[in-house]
Amino acid sequence: LPKAPVITTPLETVDALVEEVATFMCAVESYPQPEISWTRNKILIKLFDTRYSIRENGQLLTILSVEDSDDGIYCCTANNGVGGAVESCGALQVKMKPKITRPPINVKIIEGLKAVLPCTTMGNPKPSVSWIKGDSPLRENSRTAVLESGSLRIHNVQKEDAGQYRCVAKNSLGTAYSKVVKLEVEVFARILRAPESHNVTFGSFVTLHCTATGIPVPTITWIENGNAVSSGSIQESVKDRVIDSRLQLFITKPGLYTCIATNKHGEKFSTAKAAATVSIAEWSKPQKDNKGYCAQYRGEVCNAVLAKDALVFLNTSYADPEEAQELLVHTAWNELKVVSPLCRPAAEALLCNHVFQECSPGVVPTPIPICREYCLAVKELFCAKEWLAMEEKTHRGLYRSEMHLLSVPECSKLPSMHWDPTACARLPHLDYNKENPKTFPPMTSSKPSVDIPNLPSSSSSSFSVSPTYSMT
């Protein structure tokens, strides 16, 4: 007799591991024999799908190699035309050993920033993720946390966070380990010991010391007055991420020396700077040595003051005499911009003729100092107030550099023109000019009169003072 189908063994939940076989059984009693169809998540499973095997007149569904995407609800439906169709459903739970789908990668990070080491996992049951640093399990703290995704987040990365990391994914079916990755913490260059300023005598040796650290270890470069150091020797040593640089200099001129520590972070650089000054205590020393040569002046500052084509003494105590002496007059010249109109031309004449002394060529080129009388004229007549102020400043140490000491002569140490008229140089700018009495102001000063003789008129007098100008 015809009999409507009855499912005698309802489908059950099946647990299966990936790549294993999973079978659902749907035993049906009926007459005539029913047609049995299978669905997964309400989608018909086709008979010719090679991933499945349907046997026993459709009562057995076998998944030949389970994939993680096979989980879902499987239903069998039996129908033989007698009565209604019957259905039974069961779930396939794909069990999966832990698998790391996005492993961590090597990371370089600058100290103080946030680092995230990824570790995305798969597995059923859902794996728990932990991290190992070096050989020990990583303990979470206020800066370190394992995110829901399994990634490791480190806030405010510190040097001590650097090291080797791996993540571990674990569930009831097994454990998976990522490859070991490196977290490198880079640190901006920082100067630990800055060079110290020195005040030394001309021609002495000075060692400037600069120590820096950073990751990677920085390089140190030295700058002299804004340019790469051209002379001197540099010794360097590196120990425990600290670089120590010593610059040894032979001092022939004052300078500003800057230690620059630089390291590279990807395409960017970080730098740290520290500077020291080297000043010269006895600027007048090179002049005493009288080592040098005679040559025409070809600078700029004293061009209008010195006689055209005059031979000047270039002092080879300096590495580059011409430049050193020009720098000297330039520095002092700038200070003369503020002096009175009476003082300025006289002071400029004195300055240029003192730094670029007239030179007597011969077997031994000899500088000819300015005659004392002319020096005193500038000091006590033309620039009395200014000279006094400058000497006060010097005594009170208000000059930042000692450079002006070379550019201002000590009048008392200069030879007098009365001793030997050929042994000292005159300043034509200060000579009384009979044709043009305006070139020398009336001596209304109450100071002792300065012994400037009535010299022959000079065609190169270059400044003129109003006769009504009176010194106060």
Partner: antibody, heavy 121, light 112 residues
Framework: ELQLVESGGGLVQPGGSLRLSCAAS????????MSWVRQAPGKGLEWVSA????????YYKESVKGRFTISRDNAKKTLYLQMNSLKSEDTAVYYC??????????????WGQGTLVTVSS | QAVVTQEPSLSVSPGGTVTLTCGLS?????????PDWYQQTPGQAPRALIY???SRLSGVPSRFSGSFSGNKAALTITGAQPEDEADYYC????????????FGGGTKLTVL
């Protein structure tokens, strides 16, 4: 790294004008004198013009006086050579060169790679 | 205007010594001319070797030295190297003639 890069060269007709520029980097430009030196094809070096660190004076070779003007913009770290009334004998590679110190004259311790100026009709 | 004179060409054996000179068509070269020396290899910009007669620029090998020889300035290469083969120019400051800087015609040095 110290660099001097000349630009502005090219082909110009006799009587025409060109302005050469020299961009300086890697050193304190306003601490140094600068010069222009030229070299005609297959010939020797010829000094053209010089200027000290502050631009306060300018100096020229006799044959270019009144036609060429050297100038500098220390803020822009650039040296210029304005060339007017150009002649065929001005055809040369023009080098910008740095002095070893402040004043206009003396050893030229750094040179650019040069820019070619061709004066031809 | 005075012309700065140099030997058109000179040759030296590797390891040998050679002296290049720099004179004036009228008169002597003195310290007031501040003689400078330059080296130029083909296709390259010139390079300064010596300034103000005898001061060597930094990075210039010690085999290059400057001096006066008679009424001329001189550049001496002691222990010449193959890489010294180049054109050498001297340059003089001419202060009396409205401040000029004049190059010599150059010396082609061959290291055989």
């Amino acid at each position: 790294e110290l660099q001097l890069v000349e630009s502005g060269g090219g082909l110009v007709q006799p009587g025409g004008s060109l302005r050469l520029s020299c961009a300086a980097s890697g050193f304190t430009f306003d601490d140094y004198g600068m010069s222009w030196v030229r070299q005609a094809p297959g010939k020797g070096l010829e000094w053209v013009s010089a200027i000290p660190w502050n631009g306060g004076s300018t100096y020229y070779k006799e044959s270019v006086k009144g036609r060429f003007t050297i100038s500098r913009d220390n803020a822009k770290k650039t040296l210029y050579l304005q060339m007017n009334s150009l002649k065929s004998e001005d055809t040369a590679v023009y080098y910008c060169a740095k002095r070893s110190g402040r004043i206009a004259f003396g050893a030229l311790d750094a040179w650019g790679q040069g820019t070619l100026v061709t004066v031809s009709s | 205007q005075a012309v700065v004179t140099q030997e058109p060409s000179l040759s030296v054996s590797p390891g040998g010594t050679v002296t290049l000179t720099c004179g004036l068509s009228s008169g002597s070269v003195t310290s007031s001319n501040y003689p400078d020396w330059y080296q130029q290899t083909p296709g390259q910009a010139p390079r300064a070797l010596i300034y103000s007669t005898n001061s060597r620029l930094s990075g210039v090998p010690s085999r290059f030295s400057g001096s006066f020889s008679g009424n001329k300035a001189a550049l001496t290469i002691t222990g010449a190297q193959p890489e010294d083969e180049a054109d050498y120019y001297c340059a003089l400051y001419m202060g009396s003639e409205s401040r000029n800087y004049v190059f010599g015609g150059g010396t082609k040095l061959t290291v055989l």
